[in-house]
């Protein structure tokens, strides 16, 4: 019986060009975490395996950094990074737990947004 729960950072926002940490935490289970997969919609971003360590997908190597912990750091954010991210915890003996994070990447600061609409 799977008793664990995944806690995530939920819905988060960050500025274009900045960075963000995606974090999930598995609680309420004594199951052993064997691997955590990080996915963005239909793309595998990274894997952290208990024995093999981190694998970052080559196409994301420049903008994705492992950690902290089992989390993932996204750098040099673009508006195209907006969307759903999933942490998939593979555990023994429970099986698989999945957490969801929605990231919104904002064009720029509120001040800059405001400046666009000033009346000349």
């Amino acid at each position: 019986m799977m008793t664990g729960t995944i806690e995530t950072t939920g819905n988060i926002s960050a500025e274009k060009g900045g960075s963000i940490i995606l974090q999930c935490h598995l609680s309420s289970t004594t199951a052993q975490v064997t691997q955590v997969n990080w996915e963005q919609q239909d793309q595998l971003l990274a894997i952290c395996n208990a024995d093999l360590g981190w694998h970052i997908s080559p196409s994301f190597k420049d903008r994705v950094a492992p950690g902290p912990g089992l989390g993932l750091t996204l750098q040099s954010l673009t508006v195209n990074d907006t969307g759903e991210y999933f942490c998939i915890y593979h555990t023994y003996p429970d099986g698989t737990y999945t957490g969801r994070i929605f990231l919104e990447v904002l064009e720029s600061s509120v001040a800059e947004h405001g400046a666009r609409f000033q009346i000349p």
């Epitope: 691997q35 395996n49 024995d51 093999l52 997908s57 023994y92």
Partner: antibody
Framework: EVQLLESGGGLVQPGGSLRLSCAAS????????MHWVRQAPGKGLEWVSA????????YYADSVKGRFTISRDNSKNTLYLQMNSLRAEDTAVYYC???????????WGQGTLVTVSS | DIQMTQSPSSLSASVGDRVTITCRAS??????LNWYQQKPGKAPKLLIY???SLQSGVPSRFSGSGSGTDFTLTISSLQPEDFATYYC?????????FGGGTKVEIK
């Protein structure tokens, strides 16, 4: 250098048994999931079974479930496939493969031929 | 079970040709799709993993793309040593499944 060497294949009668072995070297065996894949003569690839690095989790294709047993001895760096109640349709070359992150099969053995015939 | 459908099942091409092989999954498999090359009497060899990552030591003329249900293997300029059979394989869920294979023959 990563090496996988299968052995144990041969001719067996229907209903008989065989045990295949896959000797691994050149990497930390216990860190990797290992799989068996087979290929019938002139046919495509068919996944057979998998086992986690610790041996705690095992998986089987429906076609072999209840007849085949995958196991490993990490102290001997060896993977096994015990095949019972063999049928003519089990005739194939059997390959073992290393599977990092349980996602891709990056190294394969040379294969061992199992022929089930009376 | 997830079915993997490869097309074409065979093709004839000349050295220097651009070759494209497609693979379709019966349900979304994210990017858990691998491509293998197999020559007669030999074990399969990993070319592309996780849909688009080139395996170490594989020539850059091989590339993979796609996500979800539709995937493509492209050989940008076919070389004599590329005449072989190519298989896609999903690792999204067990049972793992392979496509039926595409045999690339000399025209």
């Amino acid at each position: 250098e990563v090496q996988l060497l299968e052995s144990g294949g041969g001719l067996v009668q229907p209903g008989g048994s065989l045990r295949l072995s896959c000797a691994a070297s050149g990497f930390t065996f216990s860190s990797y999931s290992m799989h068996w894949v087979r290929q019938a003569p002139g046919k495509g690839l068919e996944w057979v079974s998998a086992i986690s690095g610790s041996g705690g989790s095992t998986y089987y294709a429906d076609s072999v479930k209840g007849r085949f047993t995958i196991s490993r001895d990490n102290s001997k760096n060896t993977l096994y496939l015990q095949m019972n109640s063999l049928r003519a349709e089990d005739t194939a070359v059997y390959y073992c493969a290393r599977v990092p992150y349980s996602v891709w099969m990056d190294y394969w053995g040379q294969g061992t031929l199992v022929t089930v015939s009376s | 079970d997830i079915q993997m459908t490869q097309s074409p099942s065979s093709l004839s091409a000349s050295v220097g040709d651009r070759v494209t092989i497609t693979c379709r999954a019966s349900q979304s498999i994210s990017s858990y799709l691998n491509w293998y090359q197999q020559k007669p009497g030999k074990a399969p060899k990993l070319l592309i993993y996780a849909a688009s990552s080139l395996q170490s030591g594989v020539p850059s003329r091989f590339s993979g793309s796609g996500s979800g249900t539709d995937f493509t293997l492209t050989i940008s300029s076919l070389q004599p040593e590329d005449f072989a059979t190519y298989y896609c394989q999903q690792s999204y869920s067990t049972p793992l499944t392979f496509g039926g294979g595409t045999k690339v023959e000399i025209k």
